[in-house]
């Protein structure tokens, strides 16, 4: 039975040209985290594997930094970065947990952080 929950940074906004940290946290389970995938819609951004470390997709290498923690830092943001991002925790023996973050990249300087929420 999957007992864990994923807490994410929720709906967030940031300014064009700036950077943002995408964070997820898996709690309420003792399952072993073997890998965390970060995806944007259907595109793989990065993987953090327990044994193999970090892999950043070549097309994002220049503006995606691994961490902090199991998070991901997106740099030099463009309006095209607006959209859904997913953290996918592969665990044993529970299976897969997925968290969703919506990022809006704004032209103006009124970018504000949204509220946190939990996905069971």
């Amino acid at each position: 039975m999957m007992t864990g929950t994923i807490e994410t940074t929720g709906n967030i906004s940031a300014e064009k040209g700036g950077s943002i940290i995408l964070q997820c946290h898996l709690s309420s389970t003792t399952a072993q985290v073997t890998q965390v995938n970060w995806e944007q819609q259907d595109q793989l951004l990065a993987i953090c594997n327990a044994d193999l470390g970090w892999h950043i997709s070549p097309s994002f290498k220049d503006r995606v930094a691994p961490g902090p923690g199991l998070g991901l830092t997106l740099q030099s943001l463009t309006v095209n970065d607006t959209g859904e991002y997913f953290c996918i925790y592969h665990t044993y023996p529970d299976g897969t947990y997925t968290g969703r973050i919506f990022l809006e990249v704004l032209e103006s300087s009124v970018a504000e952080h949204g509220a946190r929420f939990q996905i069971p």
Epitope: C48, L52, P66, L70
Partner: antibody, heavy 117, light 107 residues
Framework: QVQLQQSGVELVRPGTSVKISCKAS????????LSWVKQRPGHGLEWIGD????????NYNEKFKGKATLTADTSSSTAYIQLSSLTSEDSAVYFC??????????WGQGTLVTVSE | DIKMTQSPSSTYASLGERVTITCKAS??????LSWFQQKPWKSPKTLIY???RLADGVPSRFSGSGSGQDYSLTISSLESDDTATYYC?????????FGGGTKLEIK
Amino acid sequence: QVQLQQSGVELVRPGTSVKISCKASGYTFTNFWLSWVKQRPGHGLEWIGDIFPGGDYTNYNEKFKGKATLTADTSSSTAYIQLSSLTSEDSAVYFCSRSTIISGAYWGQGTLVTVSE
Amino acid sequence: DIKMTQSPSSTYASLGERVTITCKASQDIKSYLSWFQQKPWKSPKTLIYYATRLADGVPSRFSGSGSGQDYSLTISSLESDDTATYYCLHHGERPYTFGGGTKLEIK
């Protein structure tokens, strides 16, 4: 298996600088963050900063900015820390360490730096 | 910076005894916590990572627990080889910080 082999003991003069190496083997050097940690007797362990050789990202503890410079040579899978303007306060054992959060850290054997006239 | 308050700073315990060491963070560190064992003139050895996960090759008498701000390392039945100094480390956001250490000795 994962190994971090550090350079040997350094005895250096005050005001000079020293460069310590940490040669990694048994894993893909560019895929992991590598931290440097300082240990002085009675002062516990202090995190100096870390480097991600795969993207040449570095982070520093504010306390060590201007004192420590972290670099990495991907061709030889070696990380370096350079300590400048040395004083007796810099006499310590320096460790390199590799971690991914979701797996345990591996540590080098440590390098003793003694600053003395 | 996040401050890690580790206690006790030193303790004596008998062989076979259960020993618990705690670390309190100044804010929620989301389980980004490791425990290390260090013997004199040796490099630290990872015991626990991600708050509760046992590192490879570490005896099962060691266990980690906690979440949020409060974490603990427990040795279920103390052995003579466990004489060492133990440190916690938070590594969720930089700068990473260590607890002050707990020196564990056998009575």
